[in-house]
């Protein structure tokens, strides 16, 4: 029962992580203009994302421009885009694997196979979390490096945008949810005691018969 509860918690966390990841990837708030010192040239905020950049005027008016050419984009941006999309697809695949092995589904009947599928889904979610973490940390590293580089102009410096925080949250939720799903399925956790005997007892025979194979006529 506790195992089922952990499974549900794990999958809820991963779903929240996936939604966070999707929002993080989509929002143009990876890099935000940093106004440092007393040199504000214009009262506007620039947001930069993976797919577009937006300029927010002091009046509140916002203009967004989708990046034109894929080939003209910096390689790190292309890589971040790819990793974001891959991470989301991997998490979706993890969800499908989980659904196939969930306790409340009938896709797979055998408990052993169900446990393996849940474990696999947990691993897939963990992979998705790591994939989400890479572009977020890479972008954060670049922003911080620029911030402390004395030769980078103040106007070129950026701050960590909301998308990065969402990305970290998404990664954390995917890692945590995936980890929980892995923990709900220790080897043999969903199996009967006879399996434990066969696996861990040195005196157990090489081939142990299931209870249905023993003759019952001699038993009262």
């Amino acid at each position: 029962m506790a195992s089922a509860g952990m499974q549900i918690l794990g999958v809820v966390l991963t779903l929240l992580g996936w939604v966070n990841g999707l929002v993080s990837c989509a929002l143009p708030m990876w890099k935000v203009t940093a106004f440092i010192g007393n040199s504000i040239v214009v009262a506007q905020v620039v947001w930069e994302g993976l797919w577009m950049s937006c300029v927010v005027q002091s009046t509140g008016q916002m203009q967004c421009k989708v990046y034109d050419s894929l080939l003209a984009l910096p390689q790190d941006l292309q890589a971040a885009r790819a990793l974001c999309v891959i991470a989301l697809l991997v998490a979706l695949f993890g969800l499908l694997v989980y659904l196939a092995g969930a306790k409340c589904t009938t896709c797979v009947e055998e408990k052993d196979s169900k446990a393996r599928l849940v474990l696999t889904s947990g691993i897939v979610f963990v992979i998705s979390g790591v994939l989400t973490l890479i572009p977020v940390c890479w972008t954060a590293h670049a922003i911080i490096r620029d911030f402390y580089n004395p030769l980078v102009a103040e106007a070129q410096k950026r701050e960590l945008g909301a998308s990065l925080y969402l990305g970290w949250a998404a990664s954390g939720l995917l890692l945590l949810g995936g980890g929980l799903l892995c923990c709900t399925c220790p080897s043999g956790g969903s199996q009967g005691p006879s399996h434990y005997m066969a696996r861990y007892s040195t005196s157990a025979p090489a081939i142990s018969r299931g209870p249905s194979e023993y003759p019952t006529k001699n038993y009262v």
């Epitope: 010192g37 040199s39 790190d76 670049a142 004395p150 030769l151 102009a153 070129q156």
Partner: antibody, heavy 119, light 107 residues
Amino acid sequence: EVKLVESGGGLVKPGGSLKLSCAASGFTFNSYTMSWVRQTPAKRLEWVVTISSGGGRTYYPDSVKGRFTISRDNARNTLYLQMSSLRSEDTAMYYCIRGDYRYDGFAYWGQGTLVTVST
Amino acid sequence: DIQMTQSPASLSASVGETVTITCRASENIDSYLAWYQQKQGKSPQLLVYASTLLVDGVPSRFSGSRSGTQFSLKINSLQSEDVARYYCQHYYSIPYTFGSGTKLEIK
């Protein structure tokens, strides 16, 4: 108009010391990163040192670390470069440079002051 | 340290021609590259920063480009006032280093 005037250059013996000054005008001195870059007789450019707008952070290449010290007096709008243990390879034209709010790199250069290290 | 290899060391071209100066970084520097122009007897001047962005007041015949660790400064329709030494410089990490320079002359 941004104006950077270097002074203090001259002839010095190896192992000697020299202090360069850069008088800045035409801008808010305490808002900008300042640097020194030198140009050797062979016309090669070499970054020497950079100091943050407030003076709290300084950046040196290994070639001058421990021998050169950059400082600034924001009240006097002046940048300094204290050079000690001078070597013949330090012979160069030394330029005082101001950073910019919009542009990366070394945006505004002074006219330079010549330092000759020779016996 | 990151080495900047600039080529050619010198070049001669006619007015109206297009010339290209290249600079190769010994390792990745992203787009942290600037180009400077130094006319005879003058101090260097910043032309291009972030590998492709032109400083205000620099004629549009100048353009910068990047391909991996190779950077180029292109001068379209060369003018007599473009006679100068050109330097590339990276500012990716300390120490910041310059290319050896290219001396551009008019035929």
